[in-house]
């Protein structure tokens, strides 16, 4: 759920880390209404996720580690 590059809500499904290639942080104090993690998938989709959810935190950590190792 995004509009003009801002997430307006969060996905209600789980993404497996193997389908995600990167992420962007959306901050509520930088022009958007809510904090969000925008996951970028292999199929070139952008998915808005709740940064407070456990599965989101795990994937962010896994992706951050992957970037460091590159």
């Amino acid at each position: 759920a995004s509009n003009f590059d801002c997430c307006l809500g969060y996905t209600d499904r789980i993404l497996h880390p193997k389908f995600i290639v990167g992420f962007t942080r959306q901050l509520a104090n930088e022009g958007c209404d809510i904090n969000a993690i925008i996951f970028h998938t292999k199929k070139k989709l952008s998915v808005c996720a709740n940064p407070k959810q456990t599965w989101v935190k795990y994937i962010v950590r896994l992706l951050s580690k992957k970037v460091k190792n590159m």
């Epitope: 789980i14 497996h16 880390p17 904090n35 709740n50 940064p51 407070k52 959810q53 456990t54 599965w55 935190k57 795990y58 994937i59 962010v60 950590r61 896994l62 951050s64 580690k65």
Partner: antibody
Framework: QVQLVQSGPEVKKPGSSVKVSCRAS????????FSWVRQAPGQGLEWMGG????????IYAQKLQGRLTITADTSTDTAYMELSNLRSGDTAVYYC??????????????????WGRGTLVTVSS | QAVLTQPSSASGTPGQRVTISCSGS????????VNWYQQLPGTAPKLLIY???QWPSGVPDRFSGSKSGTSASLAVSGLQSEDEADYYC???????????FGTGTQLTVL
């Protein structure tokens, strides 16, 4: 009723490895985040890392990266923690713990509601 | 070293109200839910408060949690002898991309 049953105490030599198991019963296994937490004698709690079994890939505290391996076997509902190149400072009680909500409902990441009784690992020459 | 700072000890007499503080930063407490654990001597930790101020079932409402900015606190009212334990705050840290515990506070009932 969720129960986490850990393997028994271990005495290890410096430089060796230890593998501690944590069998979960009474709930779905694969969609919950499991953490490993340790506590050295007289010290505080230290988060070591965790795994969401359905994700397969674990995450680790930066301090233990390279020495710690966390795995999960969904066929036996068991999580494992292996620590290599042990040193005396690794002497501690090692706990496995499961989060309050499953990987989707939890918006309080790290709310570790269910705990094993702990496994004492002693590293001594 | 722990990223969340707590006083090493706190004390009170039976029936009193005691507060334990937990100080962090924007990357942990400021942006994430705070959880509190109670550890009785020789036992595994027990989740006392989750999501800043929520009680798991079975936890008496004598225990309450609050959060403001980058600090959190745990209040114990109507102090009882069985409350004598170590208390830890904890939160996810977005800079470390991991979970962090506070330094721990030993609560003594005088």
């Amino acid at each position: 009723q969720v129960q986490l049953v850990q393997s028994g105490p271990e005495v290890k030599k410096p430089g060796s490895s230890v593998k501690v198991s944590c069998r979960a019963s009474g709930g779905t296994f694969s969609t919950y985040a499991f953490s490993w937490v340790r506590q050295a004698p007289g010290q505080g709690l230290e988060w070591m890392g965790g795994i969401i079994p359905v994700f397969e890939t674990p995450i680790y505290a930066q301090k233990l990266q390279g020495r710690l391996t966390i795995t999960a076997d969904t066929s036996t509902d068991t999580a494992y923690m292996e620590l290599s190149n042990l040193r005396s400072g690794d002497t501690a009680v090692y706990y496995c713990a499961r989060e309050w909500g499953d990987y989707y409902s939890s918006v309080s990441s790290g709310a570790l509601h269910y705990w094993g009784r702990g496994t004492l690992v002693t590293v001594s020459s | 070293q722990a990223v969340l700072t707590q006083p090493s000890s706190a004390s009170g007499t039976p029936g009193q109200r005691v507060t334990i503080s937990c100080s962090g930063s924007s990357s942990n407490i400021g942006n994430n839910a705070v959880n509190w654990y109670q550890q009785l001597p020789g036992t595994a930790p027990k989740l006392l408060i989750y999501n800043n101020n929520q009680w798991p079932s079975g936890v008496p409402d004598r225990f309450s949690g609050s959060k403001s900015g980058t600090s959190a606190s745990l209040a114990v009212s109507g102090l009882q002898s069985e409350d004598e334990a170590d208390y830890y705050c904890a939160a996810w840290d977005d800079s470390l991309n991991g979970y962090v515990f506070g330094t721990g506070t030993q609560l003594t009932v005088l």
